[in-house]
Interface confidence: low
């Protein structure tokens, strides 16, 4: 037994941690029974031959955040029990062939955040027990055929944040046990068909933030176990008709930030487990009937920031479980009265930043559970009588930035708004646009007799009251309604994939400041 090196701390002798800029070489002597060794934030630039020769019981070795740029081929000799090796966050440009030879127990190898420019089949040919290989954040421009052929037990492979421009269709062919493959933030322009055919157990495929323009029709046909597919922020302009046909387990699909112009009926599905579909920031111009009809369990559908000018009455057929629908920042001028009829469970709808001139009186007829409606910044001059009457759960309605016409026809709406003023929020209230003499005045308090003196104003019709009264003490707590749903893009459930955040969280879903708290 050796004592603990002065530059290190040793807890129970078996766990050794050596940190600090004053360390310029692997400290010695190391306790012979060390099972975990961490060398972090040092000025070590090189690993010589066999610096760990006397600690053959080592199970975990972390050499991270150092100045390490050179490793001798025999640096890890005699570490036959090693199961976890991290060389992440160093300055490695080259790995010597044979570096990992003899590491027969190695299960996790982390080489991320270095400066590696190439890997070769010989690098990993001895690592037959490897389950996790992290290579993200390097400078890899290609992966040679055969590079991973011996890693038949690999379950997780991360090649994100490199400079890959092409992937050979054979490079993953032997990885039948792979569950997670990450290729995000590279320069891939297309993926050859067959590339993923051998990945029959794949559960997560991250391809976002590349330059992929074309998806081969059968690209995912062998990946029946795929649960998470990230295709956002690419250059995809069309989806082959059968592209998603064989993905029954899929529960997360991101397609935002592409160049999609149209969605053909049946393109999605059947995907009984898909809960969220993110399609914002594309170039979609219309939604045909039944385009989402296979997505029976879908709860969140984001179509904002497209160029949608037409929605077919049956576009949302089948979406009986939908809770959130975002259509803001499109080119909608008119909506069919039946377009939302099937959305019995809808809670939040955002239609702001369109060109809506009017709404059919029955537009929300079957959507009794609506809690938030965003209609600001459209071309609305009035709303049909009783359009919101049956919406007993409505707690947020945004109507500002519309050219409201404050003549006698506005009275029913004004009176309803008076009763339900708190639903409008306190940030911005709807104001009259015409006639000119009342422009800019609050629609809620406008005196219609002043607005249109030449018109006889009839007695205020008895507008059916809703279940609300302007007594805030009786309101349910609405501050959390949809507060996180539309604020951010889908956040991936792993820490090393950070490419999906949107610059202005609220701009995707268009939530108000009150909601973003």
């Amino acid at each position: 037994y050796y004592g603990c090196p002065s530059e290190c701390t040793c807890s129970r002798a078996s766990q050794v941690e050596c940190t600090g800029a004053r360390i310029v070489a692997v400290p010695t002597p190391l306790p012979w029974n060390a099972m975990s060794l961490q060398i972090l934030n040092t000025h070590i630039t090189e690993l010589s031959e066999s610096p760990f020769l006397n600690i053959s019981a080592l199970i975990a070795l972390r050499i991270e955040k150092n100045e390490l740029s050179h490793i001798m081929p025999g640096a890890f000799r005699n570490l036959g029990s090693l199961r976890y090796l991290s060389l992440a966050n160093n300055k490695l440009q080259v790995l010597p062939i044979g570096l990992f030879q003899g590491l027969d127990s190695l299960e996790s190898l982390l080489l991320s955040s270095n400066q590696l420019v190439q890997i070769q089949p010989a690098h990993f040919s001895q690592c037959s027990n490897l389950k996790e290989l992290q290579l993200h954040g390097n400078h890899l421009e290609y992966i040679p055929d055969g590079a991973f052929d011996h890693l038949v037990g690999l379950t997780k492979l991360n090649l994100g944040k490199n400079s890959l421009t092409h992937i050979s269709p054979r490079v993953f062919q032997h990885l039948g046990n792979l569950q997670v493959l990450r290729l995000y933030e590279n320069r891939l322009t297309d993926i050859p068909m067959g590339t993923f055919d051998g990945l029959v157990n794949l559960q997560e495929l991250a391809l976002q933030q590349n330059q992929i323009g074309l998806l081969s029709p059968g690209l995912f046909h062998n990946n029946h176990n795929l649960q998470r597919l990230y295709l956002s922020n690419n250059h995809i302009s069309q989806l082959p008709p059968s592209i998603f046909m064989q993905l029954p387990q899929l529960n997360r699909l991101t397609l935002f930030g592409n160049s999609l112009k149209e969605l053909s009926p049946g393109i999605f599905g059947p995907m009984p487990n898909l809960r969220e579909l993110w399609l914002y920031d594309n170039h979609i111009t219309s939604l045909p009937d039944n385009v989402f009809s296979n997505l029976r369990q879908l709860q969140v559908l984001i179509l904002s920031r497209n160029q949608i000018s037409f929605i077919s009455p049956g576009a949302f057929n089948g979406l009986t479980e939908l809770r959130e629908l975002s259509l803001h920042t499109n080119a909608l001028q008119d909506l069919d009265g039946n377009v939302f009829r099937m959305l019995a469970n809808l809670q939040n709808i955002s239609l702001q930043n369109n060109r809506l001139r009017q709404l059919p009186g029955n537009i929300f007829a079957n959507v009794n559970g609506l809690m938030t409606i965003q209609l600001q910044n459209n071309q609305l001059e009035n709303l049909p009588l009783g359009i919101f009457d049956h919406l007993g759960k409505l707690c947020e309605l945004r109507l500002y930035d519309n050219p409201w016409r404050c003549d006698s026809d506005i009275l029913p709406l004004r009176n309803w708004l008076l009763l339900n003023q708190p639903r409008l929020g306190t940030d911005t209230v709807p104001v009259c646009f015409s006639p000119a003499n009342v422009r800019g005045q609050s629609l809620i308090i406008i005196n219609v007799n002043v607005a249109v003196p030449s018109v006889h104003v009839p007695e205020v019709p008895s507008y059916p009251e809703t279940s609300w009264y302007p007594d805030t003490s009786s309101y349910p707590d609405t501050t959390s309604i949809s507060s996180t749903t539309e604020l951010t893009s889908p956040v991936e459930d792993y820490t090393d994939l950070t490419t999906i955040q949107v610059t202005d969280d609220r701009s995707v879903w268009g939530m108000t400041q009150a909601q973003s708290g």
Partner: antibody, heavy 119, light 111 residues
Framework: QVQLVQSGAEVKKPGSSVKVSCKAS????????ISWVRQAPGQGLEWMGG????????NYAQKFQGRVTITADESTSTAYMELSSLRSEDTAVYYC????????????WGQGTLVTVSS | QSALTQPASVSGSPGQSITISCTGT?????????VSWYQQHPGKAPKLMIY???NRPSGVSNRFSGSKSGNTASLTISGLQAEDEADYYC???????????FGGGTKLTVL
């Protein structure tokens, strides 16, 4: 300017082997794929296999698997193609061609080597 | 029997345009953007004219252009000239037992 220079014509007996060489100059040898393509008299082009020297492992067309061996010597920037168990239908011009490792389009070709198999 | 199907011959008069088709499957032409075209004069080695469907190597006339739709690639030669008379081969990367497949070749005659 990249050049691929092949060895000279060969006459072989059926059942024997032939080894054709292809020496590259004027470019990076290791990072490109060298393929072998043959053309029987009056016929079209047929890919036999290829090798990227920096990767080392050759890829062969299924038709030639087990009969062809492709190697590369980085020190001399030379690729070799050996075809065994020759038969008369192997009579052809054999070309070496250079291309990107990932998609095998061939931007430079050797001058061709005529191999005649005759008893 | 070649993996990719080309017409055996096409012809055209000087100044005209001609198109040569190359039909494969979703395992080769349709599945990749890796289609190339080669020109071969008698007794000479092939010369690359188009790569990755529509890219021209430097030195190749802009009279040569390539495109692809579905499982069919096409080579178009505009403003035919006498020196264009040659054999033309298409070639694709393939997701099969072979990395590379060629068409059977098309003999172009300039009338």
């Amino acid at each position: 300017q990249v050049q691929l220079v092949q060895s000279g014509a060969e006459v072989k007996k059926p059942g024997s082997s032939v080894k054709v060489s292809c020496k590259a100059s004027g470019g990076t040898f290791s990072t490109y794929a060298i393929s072998w393509v043959r053309q029987a008299p009056g016929q079209g082009l047929e890919w036999m296999g290829g090798i990227t020297p920096m990767f080392g492992t050759p890829n062969y067309a299924q038709k030639f698997q087990g009969r062809v061996t492709i190697t590369a010597d980085e020190s001399t920037s030379t690729a070799y193609m050996e075809l065994s168990s020759l038969r008369s239908e192997d009579t052809a011009v054999y070309y070496c061609a250079r291309g990107d490792w990932y998609d095998y389009h061939f931007d430079y070709w050797g001058q061709g080597t005529l191999v005649t198999v005759s008893s | 029997q070649s993996a990719l199907t080309q017409p055996a011959s096409v012809s055209g008069s000087p100044g005209q345009s001609i198109t040569i088709s190359c039909t494969g499957t979703s395992s080769d032409v349709g599945g990749y953007n890796y289609v190339s075209w080669y020109q071969q004069h008698p007794g000479k080695a092939p010369k690359l004219m188009i790569y990755e469907v529509s890219n021209r190597p430097s030195g190749v006339s802009n009279r040569f252009s390539g495109s692809k739709s579905g499982n069919t690639a096409s080579l178009t030669i505009s403003g035919l000239q006498a020196e264009d008379e040659a054999d033309y081969y298409c070639q694709s990367y393939a997701n099969r037992d072979n990395f590379v497949v060629f068409g059977g070749g098309t003999k172009l005659t300039v009338l």
